[in-house]
Interface confidence: medium
C-alpha cells in the first residue's frame, strides 16, 4: 500500500514564438485544474483505457482573467498535491498521464464547459521511497513543470511497498528505533526519519537523522537556494553547525556560476547548472541559438531562428539537463533486487546478482520454492530467501493449511456488508456508497453548476480521488 504524489510547480506558455497569451477562450475568465492518471507498465496504451493504478483530480485553481498588454505569466494553480493511493504493490514501471483542463466561467447560465488544454504522457521507472523526481514537459504550446514520487504507507516498506513490517510483542533483537520485518524475522528495517526540520519539498533522507538536498538546494535543512550559499551539494549529518560535508572554503564559495547558474561541488572542483539560454563551464556563454550547437551528447535542439529566442534540448535516453550535459544515474533507482550490484553500461543497465539469485533484475530466487509444497491450491512465490505461499481464497497460513475468512478484516467501508465469494469477497454497500469496497460516496454534497472545487471537496482540500 502507498501513495503516488504529484506536485505541479508551474503551467504556462512555452518559450518561443506562437505561445498562447492566455488559457481562456474569448468568452471570458476561466480556471484550471489537473487530472493525473496512472497506468501500469511502459506500453503505449489507448487514451481511453482505464487508469488501472488510479487517478485523481486537483481542486479548481483561482480564476484567471487575461490582462491586456501584460506579459503572459505562469498561470494560477490549484493548491496541494495530487495524490493517487495504490492498494497493491507499486509496479516500478508505469505510464504517467497529466491533463490540464480549463473550466470556462464566462457563461454563468447552465452547466460548465471544460476543455482539455494539454496532455502529457510519460513512461517512467520509479522506485517507491525515493526522492522527488522532477520533470519539465512541453505539450503543444504549453510547458508543464512538475515533481512526483511514490511512497509507501502503513507498514509497507521496500521499493515496491510489498514487504510488511509488523511490530511484534516479543522484544526485538534489533537496536532501538528499529522494527522487525516479516516474513524475514531476522531482518530489521528502520523507517528513515529525517533530521528535524528537513525540508519536505527540497530534502530527503536515506538514513535516520540525515537531511540530503535535491539539486539546487543546500543548508543543513535544505532550505537555502544553492546559488546564494557557500555550502552546496548533498548534505549529510557530518557537521551539526553548518550542514557542510566539506569544512572550510569550498569551490562554490562566492558562486562562480554566472547568469543565475547554480553551483554544486564535485570532488576537487565544481559544476554549474545553467538556466536555459546559457552554457559553458561558468554559464558565461549567452545569446545561444541552435546554430551554436548547445545540446550535448546527441541532444536535439529546437528553437527559433531569432537570436533572442530560447532553445530547448531534447535529450537522448541516459542524459538530462538544460543542455543534455548530465548523465542520468539510472542506478540511483536501485533496479537490482535482492542486493544485486547495478552497473550502468551506457547502452544498458546490468545487474550482477548475489549467489542464489538470477534474472535481469536478480528477481528470481533460485532455491526458494524447490521442494516446497503449498496446500489447498496455493502457489509458491519466490522472494527474499524464504518461500511464501500465495493461498487460494478461503485458506491462509504459511503453507495454506489454515482456513481463512476473507471478510475477517472487515474490508467493506461505510457499513457495507461483506460476503465470501468463490472468486473473492463481495461488498454490498449501504445506501449512498459505491465502489468495490464501498469507499466512494455516490452523490457528494454541496455540488453546484460551477463548483469552487470538485464535488465532495471543500476549498483547501488537496484533491479528489477517482
Amino acid at each position: 500500500a502507498g501513495v503516488f504524489e504529484l506536485q505541479i510547480h508551474s503551467f504556462g506558455p512555452g518559450p518561443g514564438p506562437g505561445a498562447p497569451r492566455s488559457p481562456c477562450s474569448a468568452r471570458g475568465p476561466c480556471r484550471l485544474f489537473f487530472r493525473v492518471c496512472l497506468k501500469p507498465g511502459l506500453s503505449e496504451e489507448a487514451a481511453e483505457s482505464p487508469c488501472a493504478l488510479g487517478a485523481a483530480l486537483s481542486a479548481r485553481g483561482p480564476v484567471y482573467t487575461e490582462q491586456p498588454e501584460a506579459p503572459a505569466p505562469d498561470l494560477p494553480l490549484p493548491n496541494g498535491l495530487l495524490q493517487v493511493p495504490f492498494r497493491d504493490a507499486w509496479p516500478g514501471t508505469f505510464s504517467l498521464i497529466i491533463e490540464t483542463w480549463r473550466e470556462e466561467l464566462g457563461d454563468q447560465i447552465g452547466g460548465p464547459a471544460w476543455s482539455l488544454l494539454a496532455r502529457v504522457t510519460r513512461r517512467r521507472r520509479l522506485a517507491a521511497g525515493g526522492p522527488w523526481a522532477r520533470d519539465i514537459q512541453r505539450a503543444g504550446a504549453w510547458e508543464l513543470r512538475f515533481s512526483y514520487r511514490a511512497r509507501c504507507e502503513l507498514l509497507a516498506v521496500g521499493t515496491a511497498c510489498t514487504r510488511l513490517c509488523r511490530p511484534r510483542s516479543a522484544p526485538s533483537r534489533c537496536g532501538p528505533g528499529l522494527r522487525p520485518c516479516a516474513p524475514l524475522e531476522d531482518e530489521c528495517e528502520a523507517p528513515p526519519v529525517c533530521r528535524a526540520g528537513c525540508s519536505l519539498e527540497h530534502g530527503f533522507c536515506e538514513q535516520p537523522g540525515e537531511c540530503r538536498c535535491l539539486e539546487g538546494w543546500t543548508g543543513p535543512l535544505c532550505t537555502v537556494p544553492a546559488s546564494t550559499s557557500s555550502c552546496l551539494g548533498l548534505r549529510g549529518p557530518s557537521s551539526a553547525t553548518t550542514g557542510c560535508l566539506v569544512p572550510g572554503p569550498g569551490p562554490c564559495d562566492g558562486n562562480p556560476c554566472a547568469n543565475g547558474g547554480s553551483c554544486s561541488e564535485t570532488p576537487g572542483s565544481f559544476e554549474c547548472t545553467c538556466p536555459r539560454g546559457f552554457y559553458g563551464l561558468r554559464c558565461e556563454v549567452s545569446g545561444v541559438t541552435c546554430a551554436d550547437g548547445p545540446c550535448f551528447n546527441g541532444g536535439l535542439c529546437v528553437g527559433g531562428a531569432d537570436p533572442d529566442s530560447a532553445y530547448i534540448c531534447h535529450c537522448p535516453p541516459g542524459f538530462q539537463g538544460s543542455n543534455c550535459e548530465k548523465r542520468v544515474d539510472r542506478c540511483s533507482l536501485q533496479p537490482c533486487r535482492n542486493g544485486g550490484l547495478c552497473l550502468d553500461l551506457g547502452h544498458a543497465l546490468r545487474c550482477r546478482c548475489r549467489a542464489g539469485f538470477a534474472g535481469p533484475r536478480c528477481e528470481h530466487n533460485l532455491d526458494d520454492c524447490a521442494g516446497r509444497a503449498c496446500a489447498n491450491g496455493g502457489t509458491c512465490v519466490e522472494g527474499g530467501g524464504a518461500h511464501r505461499c500465495s493461498c487460494a481464497l478461503g485458506f491462509g497460513g504459511r503453507d495454506c493449511r489454515e482456513r481463512a475468512d476473507p471478510c475477517a478484516a472487515r474490508p467493506c467501508a461505510h457499513g457495507g456488508r461483506c460476503y465470501a465469494h468463490f472468486s473473492g469477497l463481495v461488498c454490498a454497500c449501504a445506501p449512498g456508497y459505491m465502489g468495490s469496497r464501498c469507499e466512494f460516496p455516490v452523490h457528494p454534497d454541496g455540488v453546484s453548476a460551477l463548483p469552487a472545487a470538485p464535488p465532495g471537496l471543500r476549498p483547501g482540500d488537496p484533491q479528489r480521488y477517482l
Epitope: R35, C37, A47, E48, P50, C51, A55, L57, I109, G110, G111, P112, A113, W114, S115, L116, F440, P441, V442, H443, P444, V447, P454, P455, G456, L466
Partner: nanobody, 127 residues
Framework: QVHLVESGGGSVQAGGSLRLSCAAS?????MGWFRQAPQKEREWVAT???????????YYVDSVKGRFAISQDNAKNTVYLQMNSLKPEDTAVYVC????????????????????WGQGTQVTVSS
C-alpha cells in the same frame, strides 16, 4: 453502440417525488437528463460523470438545484434522477443521454455533446 433504457416516469401531485432510472448497455464518460415540455425547447437538467475522467462529478441547471439529485450505480451501469418538491413547470418528457466518445471538450448543457439518447419517459406534475 450504447443502448439507454429509462423508467420511473409517471404522474404526481405538486410537492411530490419521483425517481427516474436510466440503464446503459456499455461504458460511458457522462450520463445526463434532458427534458422537453410541450411547445418548448429541449432543456438540459443534470449530468453526472460515469467514466474515469470525472467520475461522480454532478452538475445541475439552476432551476432544479436543491430539489433534484443525480446519482449512479457503477456496477449496474445505471444513473438515477431523484426529483423532490416537484412543480407543475417540471412537467415534460425526460430523456436520458450519454457521452461515450473521449473528447477534449465537454459542454454539458449542449445536446450536441451527447452521442446516445433514450426514448424518454413522461413526468406529469399536477397542481
Amino acid at each position: 453502440q450504447v443502448h439507454l433504457v429509462e423508467s420511473g416516469g409517471g404522474s404526481v401531485q405538486a410537492g411530490g417525488s419521483l425517481r427516474l432510472s436510466c440503464a446503459a448497455s456499455g461504458y460511458t464518460y457522462f450520463m445526463g437528463w434532458f427534458r422537453q415540455a410541450p411547445q418548448k425547447e429541449r432543456e438540459w437538467v443534470a449530468t453526472i460523470g460515469t467514466g474515469d475522467i470525472f467520475n461522480g462529478a454532478a452538475y445541475y441547471v439552476d432551476s432544479v438545484k436543491g430539489r433534484f439529485a443525480i446519482s449512479q450505480d457503477n456496477a449496474k451501469n445505471t444513473v438515477y434522477l431523484q426529483m423532490n418538491s416537484l412543480k407543475p413547470e417540471d412537467t415534460a418528457v425526460y430523456v436520458c443521454a450519454a457521452v461515450q466518445s473521449k473528447s477534449s471538450n465537454y459542454v454539458l448543457r449542449d445536446a450536441s455533446t451527447y452521442n446516445y439518447w433514450g426514448q424518454g419517459t413522461q413526468v406529469t406534475v399536477s397542481s
